[in-house]
């Protein structure tokens, strides 16, 4: 049983007017624009902002008042700002969705320090791992290091999106007052969906007498 609860001031069950809802899509797969309505007799129009109307043909694009618009075979042409519109009592209501085709490409991963790293005991270690990806890619960056069990490191992350062709993700590992137990292999691992890359560096600790 599906129950509609009619609300003339709210034609869509979920309203995304200020911040669009993001929908991840895969080309060739079904894409649902979930602008289900509070009453089955509300007429809804699907637009690719601002100029294109996507007309339900009963085959590739189907309207279902309980689900929204179902696009059976999504293409790159459905990437963008899709808006469901309904006019109720002379008022135009809109709910917005951003369709987003995510990629999982990792272009490059680097640790921006000399290899191997030579450090005096008691000093601070700073390792900067940089991952470069296409614009529509997100990554998870993790570190493994010798005294990981004691959570010796603090990690800061940031994204640089000022490049017009790529995203650059930074993960900066810092360990204060380096001890002998901190020497060894430091690995930065970068994952994006099924894609994976890693880079490592060796850290050597010295007493002043050996420098």
């Amino acid at each position: 049983i599906y129950i509609f609860i009619s609300d003339t001031g709210r034609p869509f069950v979920e309203m995304y007017s200020e911040i669009p809802e993001i929908i991840h899509m895969t080309e060739g797969r079904e894409l649902v624009i979930p602008c289900r309505v509070t009453s089955p007799n509300i007429t809804v129009t699907l637009k690719k902002f601002p100029l294109d109307t996507l007309i339900p043909d009963g085959k590739r694009i189907i309207w279902d008042s309980r689900k929204g618009f179902i696009i059976s075979n999504a293409t790159y042409k459905e990437i963008g700002l899709l808006t469901c519109e309904a006019t109720v009592n002379g008022h135009l209501y809109k709910t917005n969705y951003l369709t987003h085709r995510q990629t999982n490409t990792i272009i490059d991963v680097q640790i921006s320090t000399p290899r191997p790293v030579k450090l005096l005991r008691g000093h601070t270690l700073v390792l900067n791992c940089t991952a470069t990806t296409p614009l529509n890619t997100r990554v998870q960056m993790t570190w493994s290091y010798p005294d990981e069990k004691n959570k010796r490191a603090s990690v800061r992350r940031r994204i640089d999106q000022s490049n017009s062709h790529a995203n650059i993700f930074y993960s900066v590992l810092t360990i204060d007052k380096m001890q002998n137990k901190d020497k060894g292999l430091y690995t930065c691992r970068v994952r994006s969906g099924p894609s994976f890359k890693s880079v490592n560096t060796s850290v050597h600790i010295y007493d002043k007498a050996f420098i």
């Epitope: 902002f49 601002p50 100029l51 294109d52 963008g80 135009l92």
Partner: antibody, heavy 119, light 110 residues
């Protein structure tokens, strides 16, 4: 590199006609809505016309040019057009061709072509 | 007379933060998203902010946008001399079936 290159501007007497062209390169032209925006000397930006990606019935014009200007496109030539008839002095401006962004707004602008209507 | 209303001018010193406002109505800003454009004299406009607050790649995070009801604003922090330009807000208008712009705000870096 994504580029829009306008041409066809010039000087014309009131009542005359001009046809502006905008050639696109560096992107799949047929996948994007396109627009014309103008800027009168020393003034702000004013939207003139828009056309959807297929160039079908979805064409829009600002009221002041309706019945005089027609926007069209030829996707096989990667070209956008603006046919301007019955030109008036107030149509004097730089005309920019612009591409719609996937997610709203006009993300690519041409360098503009100047139209001067004067007797 | 522009459909969207902006102050004609704004100014600030290097390093300062300045805000430019843009007001409209339900049929444009109230029911649609806002974009901001930067136009350096003698050049074509450039998209600065889209979807109210999103920056295209290449735009520094010193630029930020916001929207509330039928008004929007553009904030520029850490003002630099090369920010001196005209700034325009824009939105789609459901009644006019077209784009509408603000009259533009001339930003001067003192």
């Amino acid at each position: 590199e994504v580029q829009l290159l306008e041409s066809g501007g010039g000087s014309v007497q009131p009542g005359g006609s001009l046809r502006l062209s905008c050639t696109a390169s560096g992107f799949n032209f047929e996948d994007y809505g396109m627009n014309w925006v103008r800027q009168a000397p020393g003034k702000g930006l004013d939207w003139v016309s828009s056309i959807n990606r297929n160039g079908d019935i979805s064409t829009y014009h600002v009221d002041s040019v309706k019945g005089r200007f027609t926007i069209s496109r030829d996707n096989s030539k990667n070209t956008l057009y603006l046919q301007m008839n019955s030109l008036r002095a107030e149509d004097t401006a730089i005309y920019y061709c612009t591409k719609n962004h996937d997610y709203h707004g006009m993300d690519v602008w041409g360098q503009g072509t100047t139209v001067t209507v004067s007797s | 007379q522009s459909v969207l209303t902006q102050p004609p001018s704004a100014s600030g010193t290097p390093g300062q933060r300045v805000t430019i406002s843009c007001s409209g109505s339900r049929s444009n800003i109230g029911n649609n998203f806002v974009n901001w454009y930067q136009q350096i004299p003698g050049t074509a406009p450039k998209l600065l902010i889209y979807l109210n607050s999103q920056r295209p790649s290449g735009v520094p995070d010193r630029f930020s946008g916001s929207k509330s009801g039928t008004s929007a604003s553009l904030a520029i922090s850490g003002l630099q001399s090369d920010d001196e330009a005209d700034y325009y807000c824009a939105s789609w208008d459901d009644s006019l079936n077209g784009w509408v712009f603000g009259g533009g705000t001339k930003l001067t870096v003192l």
